[in-house]
């Protein structure tokens, strides 16, 4: 009989398609912050705005104390743009005096922290020179890629120098992730 070719033991079970609107996602935007003390070989992490303006967290994706918390395991697209700004005079001072306190490059790192693993994992890193550009310079660094994440993972964005981050507009510096 025709119906017998799809007997229960051979039936494929399809999970119902999940609406995109139900998936965890967040878009965080730049927020003003005062530079804090950090360890010499460790870049400081940025705080983010999570609810005002363009920022939001949805569907159990939460933001707390610099971290974006991953609520369920899966493949996520993670992205961040950080816009830096400064003045070239800082660069000439570096060259002339070898001043260690002003950078000749800027770096952004998206880092994953997993409670079960002792060391943070660098997921993405971007670096640019800042001493080759005009008098008042602006340099955005954009990072984005897909990663397999586990429930409970935490994401943060580290930068080489918080004092150079442009916090003036929420569309210049941002950080987000969404479940694919």
């Amino acid at each position: 009989l025709k119906g017998q070719e799809f007997a229960p033991s051979h039936q494929q079970v399809y999970a119902p398609l999940r609406a995109d609107g139900d998936k965890p996602r967040a878009h965080l935007t730049v927020v003003r912050q005062t530079p804090t003390q950090h360890f010499k070989n460790q870049f400081p992490a940025l705080h983010w705005e999570h609810e005002l303006g363009l920022a939001f967290t949805k569907n159990r994706m939460n933001y707390t104390n610099k971290f974006l918390l991953i609520p369920e395991s899966g493949d996520y697209f993670i992205y961040s743009q950080v816009t830096f700004r400064g003045m070239t005079s800082e660069c000439s001072e570096i060259r002339q005096a070898g001043r260690p306190n002003k950078p000749d490059s800027i770096t952004v790192v998206i880092t994953k922290v997993t409670d079960s693993y002792p060391e943070p994992t660098q997921l993405l890193m971007g670096t640019k020179s800042v001493c080759e550009v005009g008098s008042n310079w602006f340099q955005p660094i954009y990072l984005g890629a897909m990663f397999s994440l586990q429930e409970g993972d935490k994401l943060m964005v580290n930068v080489s120098d918080i004092s150079l981050v442009d916090y003036t507009k929420e569309d210049k510096t941002f950080f987000g992730a969404f479940l694919l």
């Epitope: 927020v31 912050q33 005062t34 005002l52 303006g53």
Partner: antibody, heavy 124, light 107 residues
């Protein structure tokens, strides 16, 4: 760019009410918090209350029961109404958009953007 | 409510002078302090947040310091446009109290 434009000066009699408007541009009142601060002539600044982006309000207990803050999302305007006016309510009333900032792991509020102010004079 | 006490209430100084204004909170505000400048007939302008961070566009002659309950605003070399009234404000909890102001006048 961010702008907050307030309604014009008002003269009111004691016991009356006044309603001051604050029309904003460059942002949405459903996305940012709008506060009201007043300043009596030659005096300091006094926080009155806030219309939170989600539509809730918080008032300074000093004005509780006399102040009402509302908004019209279709015109991106926030209103502050103060009732039972007395002479000591004579002041310039400002609306201001709050900003969040972090120090270490704590966040705080300040006021980077202000309206031009509305003078309310209460006199018999 | 947190009380904010500013001193002095007024100060006279000349162009080029270094001026310091202090603000004391009635309890620890953990550096959650902002400073504003206000000129007659104008709205306040944010100068400093987080006790020591300069708001965008504010000249570097303005600086802030302090922690706990005691905070300071310093203008390193007064310019003619700096003569105004200055207010501190705590941003920790409502009612987000302001200091009573310090009027900076030309000597």
């Amino acid at each position: 760019q961010v702008q907050l434009v307030q309604s014009g000066a008002e003269v009111k009699k004691p016991g009356a009410s006044v309603k001051v408007s604050c029309k904003v541009s460059g942002f949405s009142v459903t996305s940012y918090n709008v506060h009201w601060v007043r300043q009596a002539p030659g005096q300091g600044l006094e926080w009155m209350g806030v219309m939170w982006y989600g539509g809730n309000t918080d008032y300074n207990s000093k004005f509780q029961g006399r102040v009402t803050m509302t908004r019209d999302t279709s015109t991106n305007t926030v209103y502050m109404e103060l009732s039972s006016l007395r002479s000591e309510d004579t002041a310039v009333y400002y609306c201001a958009r709050a900003g969040r900032y972090y120090v270490d792991s704590n966040y705080y509020w300040d006021f980077p953007y202000w309206g031009q102010g509305t003078l309310v004079t209460v006199s018999s | 409510d947190i009380q904010m006490t500013q001193s002095p209430s007024s100060v006279s100084a000349s162009v080029g002078d270094r001026v310091t204004i202090t603000c004391r909170a009635s309890e620890d505000i953990y550096s959650g302090l902002a400073w504003y400048q206000q000129k007659p007939g104008k709205s306040p302008k944010l100068l400093i947040y987080g006790a020591s961070s300069l708001q965008d566009g504010v000249p570097s002659r303005f600086s802030g310091s302090g922690s706990g309950t005691d905070y300071t605003l310093t203008i390193s070399s007064l310019q003619p446009e700096d003569f105004a009234t200055y207010f501190c404000q705590e941003g920790l909890k409502s009612p987000y109290t302001f200091g009573q102001g310090t009027k900076l006048e030309i000597k």
